[in-house]
């Protein structure tokens, strides 16, 4: 091993801040990868790693591309994957990851699944089905053309599966209410049996959600199939078409046939022999966990190792299991001593924000966030033009129809609790993703489902309902939701994206950049209404004034939460208004504030906590 000029941290309670995220993985997976990467070093040295939410962290983690604000620009795909600086102040100790890479768990793109029997677990690539290996979603075994994947390595053994994002399941944006494509459909007198970019100048693939676009003018955008979008070849950016014909043989997944280098490829039309259109299939990507563990080694003071089996060797190779070699362990223990973690005391200075107050403090719970959604950031820019926004018809009809053979069919299209996890009883939910008062009812969101709580006698609780059935295009996991009391528009936030619904018509996703929020704002914890079309927008201990009409924050207005709301947890993960009170949720608890619903006073009169309680027992009235 080698160390870096003898540099090391002078304390053993290391703090880190995840400043921004890659779109390649869900945010909770990124959080987990970084936490596991730190834990690798904490296992063998007396170090603890605490996540904080500001630039005062020892190790600031950032995704960037090309020139990204330091003297060491990234280089596009492959080559340099990431870099880190040795321990010290400022940029020293920070770790930067090249977002031109495909970040994965080391085994290919991470594809969320829908329906099936795996509760939305991501696809496992490669997987075995009927003795064959698949490295992308497939339509094999089905007669309805809906792509699916196994969520374990062996479908034949485990039988666990889900459906991949597909226009046969749903569409995004547009005015088709999220319904699946109807194939074939008529557009400008011509019949289309697949998504098309015809009539658009922006390259977005769309389809009609009825059999005749010319007549009905109903359409949606087709989800991007990241597992099947090719690179290189002569069709970069196009989708694999399965099945395709090559040298007279039919292929239902990517193949290396015809190549000496073993690289997987596919045709982008149904017949390679006639059309000669092809590209390389997405690669396995780089394990964010492994690369992060290597970079964090640097950030702790380790230089490269000359031992090829060591994590600190300067070449990436994917491996499973505990990644440290004896050389890595010797190096970190040389710097920080033997043994594992010290007493798990919090670091002396984590952040400047106040800590949560009673009830008993809990570890900060980070609201889980959504899989990245794809599609235009604003409404459609050309033909097909949007249809009328009034009287929306019911949401999508749900799961694809069953095929005659394996894999098994998806669940019923009715709102059902069969595939809901955790249990269908909201009283069993520890922490909800988001809570909001919408149309007079308190809505509790969790993992793509929601319950409605109507505050009256009888059966006050309804649900669960599929979120995407009511609000098509929303991701499975939300950070917060808010209904504008004046216009009744509903705002949803997930990660750095926002969707705004007027009835069933959606605008979005829009990036938080468009709201005037910088990259350090990684999610929105909630909004509270003010008068005159204004609201307060919250994110991790800070609050901005937000104009609901222009959908912009006033950047000069940002203050610390405790300046306006004394005694609430600074890191509340969900904030909402209910019956004219403001609620700040942290873990299982809420802090209720008698909220002065008016424009900020000059002296920032502080709103006082008047109650602290349990979300389930006190709000949901669970037994």
């Amino acid at each position: 091993f080698q160390t870096f000029k003898g540099l090391k941290w002078d304390h053993h309670n290391i703090t880190y801040w995840i400043q921004n995220y890659s779109e390649d993985l869900p945010r909770d997976m990124i959080d987990d990868a970084f936490a596991r990467a730190f834990a690798v070093w904490g296992e063998v040295a007396p170090l603890t790693f605490t996540r904080v939410y500001g630039p005062e962290a020892d190790i600031v983690i950032q995704f960037g591309v090309a020139e990204h604000g330091d003297g060491y620009p990234f280089d596009g795909k492959d080559g340099l994957l990431a870099h880190a600086f040795p321990p010290g102040a400022g940029v020293q100790g920070d770790a930067h990851f090249d977002d031109d890479e495909l970040w994965s768990l080391g085994k290919g793109v991470v594809i969320p699944t829908y329906y099936g029997n795996s509760n939305g677990a991501p696809c496992h690539f490669p997987f075995t089905f009927e003795g064959r290996s698949y490295s992308a979603c497939t339509t094999d075994g089905r007669n309805d053309g809906t792509p699916w994947c196994s969520t374990t390595a062996d479908y034949d053994k485990d039988g666990k599966f889900g459906f991949c994002p597909s226009e046969r399941l749903y569409t995004e944006h547009g005015n088709g209410e999220g319904k699946p494509c109807v194939f074939p459909f008529i557009f400008e007198g011509r019949s289309y049996s697949a998504c098309t970019t015809k009539g658009r100048s922006d390259g977005y693939r769309w389809c009609a959600t009825t059999a005749n676009y010319d007549q009905d003018k109903l359409y949606g955008f087709c989800p991007t199939r990241v597992d099947a979008t090719v690179v290189g070849g002569n069709s970069a950016g196009e989708l694999c078409v399965f099945p395709f014909v090559f040298l007279g043989k039919q292929y239902s997944s990517c193949t290396s046939d015809g190549r000496r280098d073993g690289r997987l490829w596919c045709a982008t039309t149904s017949n390679f022999d006639t059309d000669k259109k092809w590209g390389f299939c997405p690669d396995q990507g780089y394990s964010l966990f492994l690369v992060a563990a290597h970079e964090f080694g640097h950030a702790l003071g380790l230089d490269h190792s000359s031992v090829p089996e060591a994590l600190m060797y300067p070449l990436y190779s994917y491996l499973e299991g505990f990644p440290l070699n004896k050389d890595d362990i010797d190096g970190i223990q040389y710097l920080y001593g033997r043994g594992s973690k010290p007493d798990p005391r919090p670091p002396a200075t984590t952040t400047t924000e106040p800590q949560p107050t009673a009830p008993p403090t809990m570890c900060p719970t980070i609201p889980p966030t959504a899989y990245p959604t794809v599609g235009p950031t604003v409404g459609p820019t050309g033909a097909p033009s949007p249809g009328p926004t009034s009287s929306p018809s019911p949401g999508p009809t749900g799961a694809p129809s069953p095929g005659p053979t394996a894999p098994p069919t998806a669940g019923s299209s009715e709102a059902s609790t069969e595939s809901l996890s955790p249990a269908d009883n909201p009283c069993n939910v520890d922490v909800f993703d988001a809570i909001a008062e919408i149309q007079g009812a308190l809505h509790f969101f969790k993992d793509g489902w929601y319950w409605k709580f109507l505050n009256h006698r009888g059966s006050p609780l309804q649900g669960p309902f599929l979120t995407a059935r009511t609000w098509p295009a929303l991701p499975a996991t939300l950070d917060s939701a808010f209904e504008d009391p004046q216009t009744k528009r509903v705002f949803f936030f997930s990660g750095r994206q926002m969707w705004v619904y007027t009835g069933k018509t959606v605008l979005g996703p829009r990036s938080l950049d468009k709201l005037g929020l910088g990259p350090e704002v990684t999610h929105v914890s909630g909004l509270l209404p003010r008068r005159l079309g204004k609201a307060l927008l919250f994110s991790k201990g800070r609050v901005w004034r937000f104009d609901l009409k222009s959908q912009k924050v006033d950047p000069q207005s940002v203050i610390r939460v405790d300046k306006e709301f004394s005694g609430v947890p600074w890191n509340s993960h969900d904030i909402f208004q209910y019956q004219d009170k403001a609620y700040f949720c942290h873990g299982k608890f809420f802090w209720r504030v008698s909220f002065q619903n008016e424009v900020n006073k000059v002296d920032h009169e502080v709103n006082q906590v008047d109650d602290v309680g349990y979300v389930t027992y006190d709000l949901l009235q669970c037994p």
Partner: antibody, heavy 124, light 107 residues
Framework: EVQLLESGGGLVQPGGSLRLSCAAS???????DMWWVRQAPGKGLEWVS?????????FYADSVKGRFTISRDNSKNTLYLQMNSLRAEDTAVYYC?????????????????WGQGTLVTVSS | DIQMTQSPATLSLSPGERATLSCRAS??????LAWYQQKPGQAPRLLIY???YRATGIPARFSGSGSGTDFTLTISSLEPEDYAVYYC?????????FGQGTRLEIK
């Protein structure tokens, strides 16, 4: 002992081309980022181009972008600079330099070894 | 691009004296600064990296200090072989840039 040895300089007419080489020895060449830095007669130092250790990524000063191409052959421990459309203002001693940093550990700053330089004169 | 300004342009001192060379960056570059010595007809030679670390084989009379925007190279007691041109170079932001140089000459 680390050594960098440039070659390929000479007199060339404006609009002409030259290919400079830098033979490296005494260190694991493939691990390090490599640079070309030039110095016009009587003037200061100016960076020209860098190629990262992996060989793919390259960066260029605005003054040479589109005309010069840096490359490396890790199997031959050699760095190259292909110079096309040469101009009078490209006249300089061209040095190849080894970055003290390598790969993804970017705390180091400085070029710890330099070649002796090769003179490129662009004149009609 | 970050501008690196060295002062003075020329410094005339006698052997045994203390030399102080200054380098100022137009914006903060943390400690990403290197100093080089160049003698006529020779390639530059790395003296100091990361503002304050002496490169291999560099005598202890050479020292570097500073961070942010202001940096200093100090030669505690000048030796005859120290008369040369000295350049600073930053890598706190892209692209890297060099100062225009300070000529250290015998008084």
């Amino acid at each position: 002992e680390v050594q960098l040895l440039e070659s390929g300089g000479g007199l060339v007419q404006p609009g002409g081309s030259l290919r400079l080489s830098c033979a490296a020895s005494g260190f694991t060449f493939s691990w390090y980022d490599m640079w070309w830095v030039r110095q016009a007669p009587g003037k200061g130092l100016e960076w020209v181009s860098v190629i990262y250790s992996s060989g793919g990524p390259t960066f260029y000063a605005d003054s040479v972008k589109g005309r010069f191409t840096i490359s490396r052959d890790n199997s031959k421990n050699t760095l190259y600079l292909q110079m096309n459309s040469l101009r009078a203002e490209d006249t300089a001693v061209y040095y190849c330099a080894k970055d003290r940093a390598y790969g993804d550990y970017v705390g180091w700053n400085g070029f710890d070894y330099w070649g002796q330089g090769t003179l490129v004169t662009v004149s009609s | 691009d970050i501008q690196m300004t060295q002062s003075p342009a020329t410094l005339s001192l006698s052997p045994g004296e203390r030399a102080t060379l200054s380098c100022r960056a137009s914006q903060s570059i943390s400690s990403f600064l290197a100093w080089y010595q160049q003698k006529p007809g020779q390639a530059p030679r790395l003296l100091i990296y990361d503002a304050s670390y002496r490169a291999t084989g560099i005598p202890a009379r050479f020292s570097g200090s500073g961070s942010g925007t202001d940096f200093t190279l100090t030669i505690s007691s000048l030796e005859p072989e120290d008369y040369a041109v000295y350049y600073c170079q930053q890598r706190g932001n892209w692209p890297i840039t060099f100062g225009q140089g300070t000529r250290l000459e015998i008084k």
